[in-house]
Each structure stands twice: as C-alpha cells, then as structure tokens.
C-alpha cells in the first residue's frame, strides 16, 4: 500500500556539541520494521544513516557521520522513527531527506537542521 512521509514541518534546532533528533513518520501509520529507512544529504546524496533488512548499514554511511548517528526505532511499528546525531557540528547544518522504502515504493520528506552556539544571550567574563 501507499503512504506519505512526513517530517517535523519546522527546522530542528541544536546546539553545537549536543545531540539533535530529526523525526520522520509515515502516514497512514503502519509497521515499517521491514522497510528500508534512511537519511541522506545533498549534494551527492551522502548517506547519513541507512537501515535495511532490520539492521543499520554502517558501511554505506558517509565518513563524517560514522559513529555519530543512531536510528531511534522504538515506534517503528507505528511508522515513526527519528535520526539522532551526536556531537553536532556546524557542518551538520542544512537540509536532510528522510525516506521510507517498501519494496519498490519509496517516499521521502525534507528536514532542516539549524546548528547554533550556546552563547547568544550570555556575556563572557
């Protein structure tokens, strides 16, 4: 059956050095355990995280994300996931695409990550 992929609808904000969670879900909600779920970034569709055949496909991940990402799958049975990025960097800022693929049917959604420093409202010294 067909479905839509829905992102958060607003930019996700994170502080540099902290964690970011980018949520993504399918509608109507259904079990996505057997689906391929992934995140990539332009340009060149760099793989941020890929989940296939019930496993994270670490070997396909872009080197700048290696060891820093986790697919949160607690609600994958309802078609809801989130990508956690640890040790967020300024270079992580920008557009991400999440996708769900069920056999030959694939849909995707855009998610924006905004990375900030924690010092906007503080005076040094």
């Amino acid at each position: 059956g067909q479905f839509r992929v829905i992102g958060p609808g607003h930019p996700i904000r994170a502080l540099v050095g902290d964690e970011a969670e980018l949520p993504c879900r399918i509608s109507p909600g259904k079990n996505a355990t057997g689906m391929e779920v992934g995140w990539y970034r332009s340009p060149f569709s760099r793989v941020v995280h890929l989940y296939r055949n019930g496993k994270d496909q670490d070997a396909e991940q872009a080197p700048e994300y290696r060891g820093r990402t986790e697919l949160l799958k607690e609600s994958i049975g309802e078609g809801k996931v989130a990508l956690r990025i640890q040790n967020v960097r300024f270079s992580d800022e920008g557009g991400y695409t999440c996708f769900f693929r069920d056999h030959s049917y694939q849909e995707e959604a855009a998610v924006e990550l905004k990375v900030e420093d924690p010092f906007y409202w503080i005076n040094p010294g």
Epitope: G17, Q86, R89, F90, V115, G125
Partner: antibody
Amino acid sequence: EVQLVESGGGLVQPGGSLRLSCAASGFTFSDYYVNWVRQTPGKGPEWVGFIRNKANGGTAEYAASVKGRFTISRDDSKNSLYLQMSGLKTEDTAVYYCILSDTGAFDVWGPGVLVTVSS
Amino acid sequence: ELVMTQSPATLSLSPKETATLSCRASQSVRSYLAWYQQKPGQAPRLLIYGASTRATGIPARFSGSGYGTDFTLTISSLEPEDFAVYYCQQYSSWYTFGQGTKLEIK
C-alpha cells in the same frame, strides 16, 4: 586541505593599533565559526573572541580582557577573517592564532603570528 | 570564571609506556571538553573533543574519558612523537584552557 594563515603581526607601541588578517582555504569559509586565540610563552592559550557564521548572523563575541578594544570581522567573499586591535597593552603581547570551529572545540589552527607590544 | 586545572605539571615517561593526564574543571562542563597537543614552535592540534571523541586523523592510542568535572587523557604505548605539551580546554561556558602538562622523555 583546510588551511588558515595569519598575517599582520609585528611590533607596536602601547596604546597603538594593529590589524591581523587570516586567509582561509580548502573549505566553505562562510559556513563556519572562526576564533582568535592568543598564547604567551610557557602559558596555556587564551580565547580572544569568535565570529559566527553567516547562518547565525555573523556577529562576534569577545573575552572580557579585550572587549571594547578588539573587533573581529569577516569577509566571506575573500575567505578572510580580521582582528582589529586598538588601545594595545604590553599584556597583549602574544602569538595570535586564527582557528576554525566545527565541533564546538578548536578544530583547525593557523600557524600563528607574533604581536609584540613594547615601547 | 571557569578554571581548568591540569595535573601533573610534568610527566616523565619512556616510549612504550602509558601516560595518564588529568584535568579538573571548577564546575561541571558536561562533556564539553577538548584535549590538544602542542610541540615547540607549533600551534596546538586538536586530539579529542566531546571528552572522548578522537579528532580526524588522531591515532587510536589517544583516548579521552570523563564527564562533569574530572577528565583523563590516556596515551597508550607512547611513541617518540608523543612527547609534547598537552592542554585541556572547556567549551561549556565560553572557553578556558588548563595550564598544560609537559610530557617528557625519561
């Protein structure tokens, strides 16, 4: 290859002014925060200030010891960072480093440039 | 101001030994802690950020641990090129460095 190179150092009298430059190459300069840090011989480095990337407004923040005397600016079209120093004191004598920040820590350092404040 | 205190000031070891460097923050910096290596006449080089994550190109013999106020840099099986000054730095509340630990050949 990511590279930062400082220039403009030298000898200046107390109360005088000096402008340091930092030329960046090998990365998209406008995407990153850039810091100035200084170090005197035998001591740990001291943070001077940083300037935010374009996405976060390009505004600068300063250490209390230099606030009101030093100004950091950037020209993304020239891949360049600047440190305008005025009202210089003898205690400002140090090697000054330009540093790229991606992780929040100080990821890539230039080789440094010496500033000597003396009469 | 957040103060970073490193110990010992000097550490004398032989190649192939293990070095353990300590850094203490005057208040919690969570995991916003970095380690740098500096050799004479050179700029510092980032080794570890986020208390335990190795920077790009840093050998596996360098490892960092700790959280909050107490942190450790461990260098296993010392190589001749590892003898240098090491600084810790917090980036939780602006930026402050420790005074450094000099790792010298015994």
